[in-house]
């Protein structure tokens, strides 16, 4: 059997760090057997069998010129094996973030915080967090850990299905390469990361006979459960063409009649969605839909006080809406109140009420 431990990665490749001492191991001999080392294709002896280093070649302070293929030979000239040296860096803790478009599932994505230059894989798992009381500590319910199944198409993403809305989870993403492993932990609560997809099917229609009215209608995003335990609320913005400022209303349902449209001008309309009890954040805006009020026979325009009139927002021209007001919570947000980064690597608690 080979004296060389097989690092994770392609066979025949050994690894080291630039600027560090690197040991190469001759794979086809017995541990301790003296061998001679050569660079592939070069006759110059790098290290002879009398080095006292046995089956190993030591390269002090390796650099990029040392990368390549090496050959080891036994005392009788037989080939002991070929070894390819690749230099790179140990893993660093990956950057991890998690998102949820509904209240039953969430996904986490990751990216390297430093490029190692080496073959790299990621191990992903999660468990449910539980703080045990003294009298309940004798029997802990099943809290995992469980694997977080990764995207079969190779995207840096894993998905947790069937998560509990009220629970908190800890995600573990470990970056592994031949020089080691490094772990990032992240605490996740669906309540805080919930961000619905934008509403779909937005239509804007004129109201015949009402030159200042437009009727907008839309549907729940397809990603929201079809028979939801938790409903969505909506925010609608509209503005006449060439007008810089949006007017905003919060409709009661899946449609809104705008009663202060500018007669004769096309209007842009967009909608956003959020959990109806303010968990998480507002969705991105839907694609804009356009509509122009009717120019037909005039009806008496009686103010319809049952319809919320849009308030003019001062020059809200950014794609994202201004920050939503802080969500009410029965529990404090346990994150630090300042922005210091004490060490390595926290969830918002929110209870629907």
């Amino acid at each position: 059997s080979s004296p060389c431990p097989q690092a994770w990665g392609p066979p025949g490749v050994q690894y080291g760090q630039p600027g560090r001492s690197v040991k190469l191991c001759c794979p086809g001999v017995t541990a301790g057997d003296p061998v001679s080392w050569f660079r592939d294709g070069e006759p110059k002896l790098l290290q002879g069998p009398d080095s006292g280093l046995g089956h190993e070649l030591v390269l002090a302070q390796a650099d990029s010129t040392d990368e390549g293929t090496y050959i080891c030979q036994t005392l009788d000239g037989a080939l002991g094996g070929t070894v390819t040296l690749q230099l790179g860096y140990p893993p660093a803790r990956p950057v991890v973030s998690c998102q949820a478009a509904d209240y039953e599932n969430f996904s986490c994505t990751w990216s390297p915080s430093q490029i190692s230059g080496l073959p790299t894989r990621y191990l992903t798992s999660y468990r449910k967090k539980t703080v045990l009381g003294a009298d309940s500590q004798r029997r802990s319910p099943s809290t995992g850990p469980w694997p977080c199944p990764q995207d079969p198409l190779g995207a840096a993403r894993c998905v947790v299905h069937g998560a509990e809305f009220w629970s908190q989870y800890r995600i573990n993403v470990t970056e592994v390469n031949p020089l080691g492993a490094s772990t990032r932990l992240l605490d996740v609560s669906l309540q805080s990361i919930l961000r619905p997809d934008p509403p779909q099917g937005l239509r804007v229609e004129s109201v015949p006979g009402y030159p200042r009215r437009l009727r907008a209608s839309w549907t729940y995003p397809a990603s929201w459960p079809s028979q939801p335990h938790f409903l969505l609320k909506f925010r609608l913005q509209y503005r006449p063409a060439q007008h810089p400022a949006w007017s905003t209303v919060e409709p009661a349902g899946l449609e809104e009649v705008i009663t202060d449209a500018v007669a004769g001008l096309p209007h842009a309309v967009r909608v956003s969605a959020r959990d109806f009890l303010d968990a998480g954040t507002w969705s991105t805006w839907s694609p804009e839909a356009w509509g122009t009020p009717s120019t037909g026979p005039l009806q008496d325009e009686i103010p319809d006080w049952s319809q919320g009139h849009g308030q003019q927002l001062e020059a809200v021209v950014a794609q994202e809406d201004s920050p939503a007001p802080a969500r009410p919570s029965l529990q404090p947000d346990p994150r630090p109140l300042d922005h210091r980064d004490p060490l390595e690597q926290h969830h918002h608690h929110h209870h629907h009420h």
């Epitope: 950057v95 991890v96 973030s97 468990r127 967090k129 539980t130 703080v131 045990l132 009381g133 500590q137 802990s140 809290t143 995992g144 850990p145 800890r170 573990n172 490094s182 772990t183 932990l185 992240l186 605490d187 529990q331 404090p332 947000d333 346990p334 994150r335 630090p336 109140l337 300042d338 210091r340 980064d341 004490p342 060490l343 390595e344 690597q345 926290h346 969830h347 608690h349």
Partner: antibody
Framework: EVQLLESGGGLVQPGGSLRLSCAAS????????MGWVRQAPGKGLEWVSY????????GYADSVKGRFTISRDNSKNTLYLQMHSLRAEDTAVYYC???????????????????WGQGTMVTVSS | QSALTQPPSASGSPGQSVAISCTGT?????????VSWYQQHPGKAPKLLIY???KRPSGVPDRFSGSKAGNTASLTVSGLQAEDEADYYC???????????FGTGTKVTVLG
Amino acid sequence: EVQLLESGGGLVQPGGSLRLSCAASGFTFSWYFMGWVRQAPGKGLEWVSYIYPSGGSTGYADSVKGRFTISRDNSKNTLYLQMHSLRAEDTAVYYCARDEGYCSSTSCYFDAFDIWGQGTMVTVSS
Amino acid sequence: QSALTQPPSASGSPGQSVAISCTGTSSDVGGYNFVSWYQQHPGKAPKLLIYEVTKRPSGVPDRFSGSKAGNTASLTVSGLQAEDEADYYCSSYGGSNNAGVFGTGTKVTVLG
């Protein structure tokens, strides 16, 4: 059954060394933050040391910094406290405790010890 | 890492309420919502009562409640019972060196 069991306490002379161990069972040890807390006879609780799940980061009380080293072996589900240069004021019951901790995208924080061992007595005396 | 300040003792009759304060600084109690409370009976290991300022672990009676204002956290024990006679300690994330800090401890006596 979720359990922590300390061992390694005893009588040691001032300037001496001791290693405490804490065997964990009933939970996935490698996922939890762990710590040591001590209580001198008739006194209050004193936070001693803390270690992250991977063992990569640690924290110490000023009173033990440079003398005590916390470590863990996740393959053995065991937490350790190596104590050097022991002083009379280190005499105490030493508790091993578990913490869920709290991890944001940038940092982890000590939260609360929800499971405690029964304690092991360390006496430093000549 | 100075210990958090608690009153040395507090007392109440069965059925009454008792409140224990825990005063720190903006670097510990005031700066983070990681305040916890522990109960310790003589000769026993401490037990967690409250974590993250207000939350109760499973199995802890709702007679125990926590709160925080500025740099001071409080534990309230309502409907005092004989078995509540014990020492109580607060604890907070300390903000430096990834360190924690305990309070000085309060001995609660149930009268009568």
